[in-house]
Amino acid sequence: LTCLGGFASPGPVPPSTALRELIEELVNITQNQKAPLCNGSMVWSINLTAGMYCAALESLINVSGCSAIEKTQRMLSGFCPHKVSAGQFSSLHVRDTKIEVAQFVKDLLLHLKKLFREGQFN
């Protein structure tokens, strides 16, 4: 049984599955939003499409105490090859430009759907 247990354990999640799950989580957030998401917190906007996962995580990780986006933060970290901590500022961000978390999540969902349709899973 011990040996068989090795075969039964799940392997790495394919990128397409991980992206689909992230999209589903964002759909969940946008559809179930009643009060302002994360109390209307603001995050840094992004002005480029390359390195988007890390940049998105760098923005969202600065929102603390918002359980609604904690799963999204964890999922995004799986797409970002380096460790991201609060306070990091990527060149992808638009300095002095912040947008509401709700809009950020909505826009992230739009972009990820495009990537999924185009087959860009990484």
Epitope: S45, I46, T49, Q103, K106, L110, H111
Partner: nanobody, 118 residues
Framework: GVQLLESGGGLVQPGGSLRLSCAAS????????MGWARQAPGKGLEWVSR????????YYADSVKGRFTISRDNSKNTLYLQMNSLRAEDTAVYYC???????????WGQGTLVTVSS
């Protein structure tokens, strides 16, 4: 909130040129397909041009092909429309807008008036 602010309109003589700009804020401009639409006096709304989010694919209405050029600068959150060889029939209010098929992603500017007259 989301804002799209057009500028660059005005009065120009036939054959002249204008460059319209649209400054975007409150959303992630770089991830949106964008476009320009226009409404001539007493006419309906007409899409003039669209550009994909990465800027590598553009579309033009037949009426402006070869005369108008759409472009974008994602680092500046700005959309442009270069209009050359202007004609009287190009007179209209020009609107900057998101060009997404996805419901709920429809944002429009207030418009800028372009008048082509001698």
């Amino acid at each position: 909130g989301v804002q799209l602010l057009e500028s660059g309109g005005g009065l120009v003589q036939p054959g002249g040129s204008l460059r319209l700009s649209c400054a975007a804020s409150g959303f992630i401009f770089a991830w949106y397909d964008m476009g320009w639409a226009r409404q001539a006096p007493g006419k309906g709304l007409e899409w003039v041009s669209r550009i994909t989010h990465h800027g590598n694919v553009t579309y033009y209405a037949d009426s402006v092909k070869g005369r108008f050029t759409i472009s974008r600068d994602n680092s500046k959150n700005t959309l442009y429309l270069q209009m050359n060889s202007l004609r009287a029939e190009d007179t209209a209010v020009y609107y900057c807008a998101t060009a997404e098929d996805e419901p709920g992603y429809d944002y429009w500017g207030q418009g800028t008036l372009v008048t082509v007259s001698s």
